[in-house]
């Protein structure tokens, strides 16, 4: 089902997908169809640099997972960028987190045996007012 440039080496303990007893409960086609057909280079993919709470992109890679690469946001500053381009610590940069579903190879190194897994990823950062605790 996963058509890719290289083949995941087969673990001898993998269930045999040709076996009549191989569970057929769920068949997942990993080719995602409703994607935009092209990408405009002028499209705003640079929010991570232009945001008032900019972030760096960390390449979260795991060969035992599909998708094997997930881009995660790491906020660059504790504060936010003000109109002068300086970091203002009266505001806070915080990550925006999203729970997503991924497929985890199980047993490990098996090319066509997966289990569904939920993971929490940071998809960007936003600027918030800090919570101020007043001490009596």
């Amino acid at each position: 089902i996963v058509k890719a440039g290289i083949t995941i080496p087969r673990n001898p303990g993998c269930p045999n997908s040709e076996d009549k007893n191989f569970p057929r409960t769920v068949m997942v086609n990993l080719n995602i169809h409703n994607r935009n057909t092209n990408t405009n280079p002028k499209r705003s993919s640079d929010y991570y640099n232009r945001s008032t709470s900019p972030w760096n992109l960390h390449r979260n890679e795991d060969p035992e997972r599909y998708p094997s690469v997930i881009w995660e946001a790491k906020c660059r500053h504790l504060g936010c960028i003000n109109a002068d381009g300086n970091v203002d610590y009266h505001m806070n940069s915080v990550p925006i987190q999203q729970e997503i579903l991924v497929l985890r190879r199980e047993p490990p190194h098996c090319p066509n045996s997966f289990r569904l897994e939920k993971i929490l990823v940071s998809v960007g950062c936003t600027c918030v007012t800090p919570i101020v605790h007043h001490v009596a």
């Epitope: 890719a4 440039g5 290289i6 080719n31 390449r59 094997s68 690469v69």
Partner: antibody, heavy 118, light 110 residues
Framework: EVQLLESGGGLVQPGGSLRLSCAAS????????MNWVRQAPGKGLEWVSG????????FYADSVKGRFTISRDNSKNTLYLQMNSLRAEDTAVYYC???????????WGQGTMVTVSS | QSELTQPPSASGTPGQRVTISCSGS????????VYWFQQLPGTAPKLLIY???QRPSGVPDRFSGSKSGTSASLAISGLRSEEEADYYC???????????FGGGTRLTVL
């Protein structure tokens, strides 16, 4: 069979422009990240640019930032590299690479030569 | 100058085990997976190792990769004359938001 075929290289004067293309076949193009890597004559490999998450993110080496633009057309299974304001130091073989099950650089094209000279 | 440091050359005799090192920093090797490539003379590079120690199908198990801290290494056991080539390491760099390659190691089979 998975294949990448680069084209568009050639001789160009300093300050000129070129557009490289990389035609892909044998796989679902839109699913995978693509990179351009170059190799100057007699030198090592240098990453140039990459496009990920169906174009959601594009990255560039500092040496080409502001001059080169990477893009892809999933309907044509083609990756592009628009190169402007070319310099002599951009002279190299440019390779198109595909990242799939292993994450990156699984498959390489044969390369296309770009020569920047007056 | 490359962000990842490799010895410019290495050598070994047929059947021998050779190791090629690759040194980086926390933002690249220390935080991300390492890739290794083989480039035979006059050909495009070929992926040898991905995700530190994983071999694509078709790559013999004589090739192995490992990583510790901010350094990585490629080991080739049972060296063959046809493995005389240039070997490169690479890793994503979080600080640069880009890939960094080593300068390459030319392996000579004596």
């Amino acid at each position: 069979e998975v294949q990448l075929l680069e084209s568009g290289g050639g001789l160009v004067q300093p300050g000129g422009s070129l557009r490289l293309s990389c035609a892909a076949s044998g796989f679902t193009f839109s699913e995978y990240e693509m990179n351009w890597v170059r190799q100057a004559p007699g030198k090592g490999l240098e990453w140039v640019s990459g496009i990920y998450s169906s174009g959601g993110y594009t990255f560039y080496a500092d040496s080409v930032k502001g001059r080169f633009t990477i893009s892809r057309d999933n309907s044509k299974n083609t990756l592009y590299l628009q190169m402007n304001s070319l310099r002599a130091e951009d002279t190299a073989v440019y390779y198109c690479t595909l990242g799939s099950a292993g994450g990156a650089f699984d498959i390489w094209g044969q390369g296309t030569m770009v020569t920047v000279s007056s | 100058q490359s962000e990842l440091t490799q010895p410019p050359s290495a050598s070994g005799t047929p059947g021998q085990r050779v190791t090629i090192s690759c040194s980086g920093s926390y933002s690249n090797i220390g935080s991300n997976y390492v890739y290794w490539f083989q480039q035979l003379p006059g050909t495009a590079p070929k992926l040898l190792i991905y995700s530190n120690n994983q071999r694509p199908s078709g790559v013999p198990d004589r090739f192995s990769g490992s990583k510790s801290g901010t350094s990585a290494s490629l080991a080739i056991s049972g060296l063959r004359s046809e493995e005389e080539a240039d070997y490169y390491c690479a890793a994503w760099d979080d600080s640069l938001s880009g890939w960094v390659f080593g300068g390459g190691t030319r392996l000579t089979v004596l």
